[in-house]
């Protein structure tokens, strides 16, 4: 079964020296959930032949993803610390349904799905620490999470397979849009 | 073209202070992670401290901790290294260095330095 | 002291190869791909060569190349030649938020 960071042999060091810091325990924790979406990719390529499709845009009208902006502050030109951090776990909160939305859309890798789905709520409790302007961070409605599934679940297999590998493109892309951003923090 | 242009340097007793300065230019300076880098009379480099982009979050090396301070000035393109109860061990060429972009702790750009000398 | 040891110097005659180690332990090496690599010409600033254990900075030669194994980086350049002669840092992430250098090693080009 997929391990969280911090649980296993490699990643917690010999008991005589220090744990991870903040800053380390983020960057372990994205690129473990990279490593997740890899493996979710890859059963979703070998499945359908969404991968190769060029027909993406049709469902992606369906769906409102999180994606990093220019005004986001996240990119090397007009960088901002507090607004990028904001954007992140703005963004992370906004994918949580999406996630929750996958976890039925695996056979082989099912519990990679709960992994990357609970990595990333722990992902979200180190940077709200992190972060000093909480104030600015919105949580998206659960009533509004609740339609969104029940609408997205409500597809045709076709368009719930092509909603599937968009997803893990767009929070490929945003996560590691946000390791590169978290790294001038 | 980047540039790093180190200054406030000079020889300062023990116990004494000093203030280096380091004034960026030919890129957005509130963008980048930056660094202090130092190195000793015919010695290797060593790590001081960094500061995050926006000036947040600050790190030291062990040998500097609670005697240095790092900070930043966003609106005027400069990075500031506060020295404070100075050490004879403490004389070096202090560079001014500016993290790669998106790099986990790689410096890309240096400036040519400026002597630090503690001596009575 | 350095933390990262690095060979004091070594030699190479011009259009061969040689490799330079950085030994660390897995609390900065080991701990993830973020060694990095530096070239100080005699009187100059240092200049990053090589990023990430593997990668090339801008603008530097493909004679440059870095690897890593276990809690070991090396620097290897091949096709030496007379301008390589400076002396080469290998820098590396440290547990708890630090950057750590090795003590240098000069190159030293023969002939």
């Known amino acids: 079964a997929p391990v969280l960071p911090g649980e296993d042999s490699k990643d917690v060091a010999a008991p005589h020296s220090q744990p991870l810091t903040s800053s380390e325990r983020i960057d372990k924790h994205i690129r473990y959930i990279l490593d997740g979406i890899s493996a979710l990719r890859k059963e979703t390529c070998n499945r359908s032949n969404m991968c190769e499709s060029s027909k993406e845009a049709l469902a992606e009208n369906n769906l409102n993803l999180p994606k990093m902006a220019e005004k986001d502050g996240c990119f090397q030109s007009g960088f901002n610390e507090d607004t990028c951090l904001v954007k992140i776990i703005t963004g992370l909160l906004e994918f949580e349904v999406y996630l929750e939305y996958l976890q039925n859309r695996f056979e082989s890798s099912e519990e990679q799905a709960r992994a990357v789905q609970m990595s990333t709520k722990v992902l979200i409790q180190f940077l709200q620490k992190k972060a000093k302007n909480l104030d600015a961070i919105t949580t998206p409605e659960p009533t509004t999470n609740a339609s969104l599934l029940t609408k997205l679940q409500a597809q045709n297999q076709w368009l719930q397979d092509m909603t599937t590998h968009l997803i893990l493109r767009s929070f490929k892309e945003f996560l590691q849009s946000s390791l590169r951003a978290l790294r001038q923090m | 073209e980047v540039q790093l242009v180190e200054s406030g340097g000079g020889l300062v007793q023990p116990g004494g202070s000093l203030r280096l300065s380091c004034a960026a230019s030919?890129?957005?300076?509130?963008?980048?992670?930056m660094s202090w880098v130092r190195q000793a009379p015919g010695k290797g480099l060593e790590w001081v401290s960094r500061i995050s982009s926006g000036g947040i979050s600050t790190y030291y090396a062990d040998s500097v901790k609670g005697r240095f301070t790092i900070s930043r000035d966003n609106a005027k393109n400069t990075l500031y290294l506060q020295m404070n109860s100075l050490k004879p061990e403490d004389t070096a060429v202090y560079y001014c260095?500016?993290?790669?972009?998106?790099?986990?702790?790689?410096?890309?750009?240096w400036g040519q330095g400026t002597q630090v000398t503690v001596s009575s | 002291q350095s933390v990262l040891t690095q060979p004091p110097s070594v030699s190479g005659s011009p259009g061969k190869t040689v490799t330079i180690s950085c030994a660390g332990t897995s609390s900065d090496v080991g701990y993830g791909n973020y060694v990095s690599w530096y070239q100080q010409l005699p009187g100059m600033a240092p200049k990053l060569l090589i990023y990430?254990?593997?990668k090339r900075a801008s603008g530097i030669a493909d004679r440059f190349s870095g690897s890593k194994f276990a809690n070991t980086a090396s620097l290897t350049i091949s096709g030496l030649q007379s301008e390589d002669e400076a002396d080469y840092y290998c820098a590396s992430y440290k547990r708890g938020d630090n950057a750590v250098f090795g003590g240098g090693t000069k190159l030293t080009v023969l002939g």
């Open positions: 260095v500016r993290y790669a972009w998106g790099v986990q702790w790689a410096f890309d750009f």
């Open positions: 990430d254990v593997n």
């Open positions: 030919g890129f957005t300076f509130s963008s980048y992670a």
